[in-house]
Amino acid sequence: GVFNYEAETPSVIPAARLFKSYVLDGDKLIPKVAPQVISSVENVGGNGGPGTIKNITFAEGIPFKFVKERVDEVDNANFKYNYTVIEGDVLGDKLEKVSHELKIVAAPGGGSIVKISSKFHAKGYHEVNAEKMKGAKEMAEKLLRAVESYLLAHTAEYN
C-alpha cells in the first residue's frame, strides 16, 4: 500500500538560513552537529542536484546502519527539497521506498516552519506501522534541533 504522513516543526531560524545550512550544506553540517545520530554522508554519484545518490551511515547505538537516498528536486527559490530513501535497513522487509519533501516557509512571527510530507511505499498491500512514520519525523526533528543549536551559537555562519 501507499501511506501519507505530514508533519510540521517550528524553528527560530529564518527560512533562508535554515535551508542553506540544514538542506544545502546538510551533508557536511549534520554529521558535524549530530555525530551521535549520523556518522557520515557520502555522495556516491551526481553533483547534488536531481539524481544524486547519497550513502548515509548512522552512528553506533542507532538501530539502523545505513540508508541510500536519491535527490529528486532542489528548489532554492522556494526552499523545497525532495528526496527518496531507496535502500537500507531502515526500509525493513515491508517498505519499497519512502519519499520525503521538506519545505521551509517563513513563520508569521519570525523564524520558520519546516513542513515535511512523506509517502511510504509498502511492498504488496502491507500496512505501514504508524510508529515507523512517527519515527522518521522524530529523527528529522532531532537533526533539525542540532542544526538550530549550531546556528544559534555561530551567528556569522550561513547568512
Epitope: 500500500g1 501507499v2 501519507n4 505530514e6 529528486d72 528536486e73 525532495n82 527518496t84 519499497e96 519519499s99 520525503h100 519533501e101 513542513k115 510530507s117 512523506s118 509517502k119 511505499h121 509498502a122 511492498k123 504488496g124 498491500y125
Partner: antibody, heavy 119, light 107 residues
C-alpha cells in the same frame, strides 16, 4: 517541462471497449505513481484508478473494478487504461494525473480525452 | 469510503474580496488533503497539498488550513483569474475521494 498527453478516447457503444494512453515527458516517469481521474459532462471530478511507480500496487474505485485495467510501461513513459464492458455512465473526460513524489496529491494533469458511450 | 463535502456549492463575489471555501471530511483525513482549481475547458491545477502547503507557482493569496475533518481554502483578495471551480481531495485512505466542488462566480 512536465507534460502528460492522453489519447484513445472516442465514441463507443455500450458493452464496447477502449484503451486510453497517456504519454509522459519532462520527468523520470519510472519514479512516479500515476492516476486516472474522470469528469462526466457538467459534473465534478472522480478518481478512478491508481498505479504505483513500480506497478506493485494498483487500486480502483468500486464502480470500475473488474471492467477497467490500469497498466504502465516505464520504458515507453506510458500509462494505460483498458476499459471493457463500457456503460453510458462511463461517459466522461478522462485525465491522467501524476502523483507528487512525497504526497498523494496530483501535481500535474493531462488535457484529458473524451470517452462517449452511446448507442 | 470517506465522503468529502464542500460548501457553499456556489459563491458570488466581487474582485478584491476575501473568499473562504470549506471542505468537510466524513472522518479524519489527518493533513492529507489537497485543493485544486479548474477553469472551464481546462484540466484541474494543484493549488494546495498537505492541507496548507502551497504548490509551486501558486500565488501567495491562496492559503489552506485545517486538519482532521475541517479544512478551509482562503483567497485573500480575489483576482479576475480566480473565478473558477475549486475541489478538495483527500488522500488519507482508499479510495481517494474528491468533493463535489465550489463554483466561485462574479457577483
Amino acid at each position: 517541462e512536465v507534460q502528460l498527453v492522453e489519447s484513445g478516447g472516442g465514441l463507443v457503444q455500450p458493452g464496447g471497449s477502449l484503451r486510453l494512453s497517456c504519454v509522459a515527458s519532462g520527468f523520470t516517469f519510472s519514479n512516479y505513481d500515476m492516476n486516472w481521474v474522470r469528469q462526466a459532462p457538467g459534473e465534478g471530478l472522480e478518481w478512478i484508478s491508481y498505479i504505483s511507480y513500480s506497478d506493485h500496487n494498483i487500486y480502483y474505485i468500486d464502480s470500475v473494478k473488474g471492467r477497467f485495467t490500469i497498466s504502465r510501461d516505464n520504458a515507453k513513459n506510458s500509462l494505460y487504461l483498458q476499459m471493457n464492458s463500457l456503460r453510458a455512465e462511463d461517459t466522461a473526460i478522462y485525465y491522467c494525473a501524476r502523483e507528487a513524489l512525497a504526497s498523494s496529491s496530483f501535481d500535474y494533469w493531462g488535457q484529458g480525452t473524451l470517452v462517449t458511450v452511446s448507442s | 469510503e470517506i465522503v468529502m463535502t464542500q460548501s457553499p456549492a456556489t459563491l458570488s463575489v466581487s474582485p478584491g474580496e476575501r473568499v473562504t471555501l470549506s471542505c468537510r471530511a466524513s472522518q479524519s483525513v489527518s493533513g492529507n488533503l489537497a485543493w485544486y482549481q479548474q477553469k472551464p475547458g481546462q484540466a484541474p491545477r494543484l493549488l494546495i497539498y498537505s492541507a496548507s502547503t502551497g504548490a509551486t507557482g501558486v500565488p501567495a493569496r491562496f492559503s489552506g488550513s485545517g486538519s482532521g475533518t475541517e479544512f478551509t481554502l482562503t483567497i485573500s483578495s480575489l483576482q479576475s483569474e480566480d473565478f473558477a471551480l475549486y475541489y478538495c481531495q483527500q488522500y488519507n485512505k482508499w479510495p481517494r475521494t474528491i468533493g463535489q466542488g465550489t463554483k466561485v462566480e462574479i457577483k
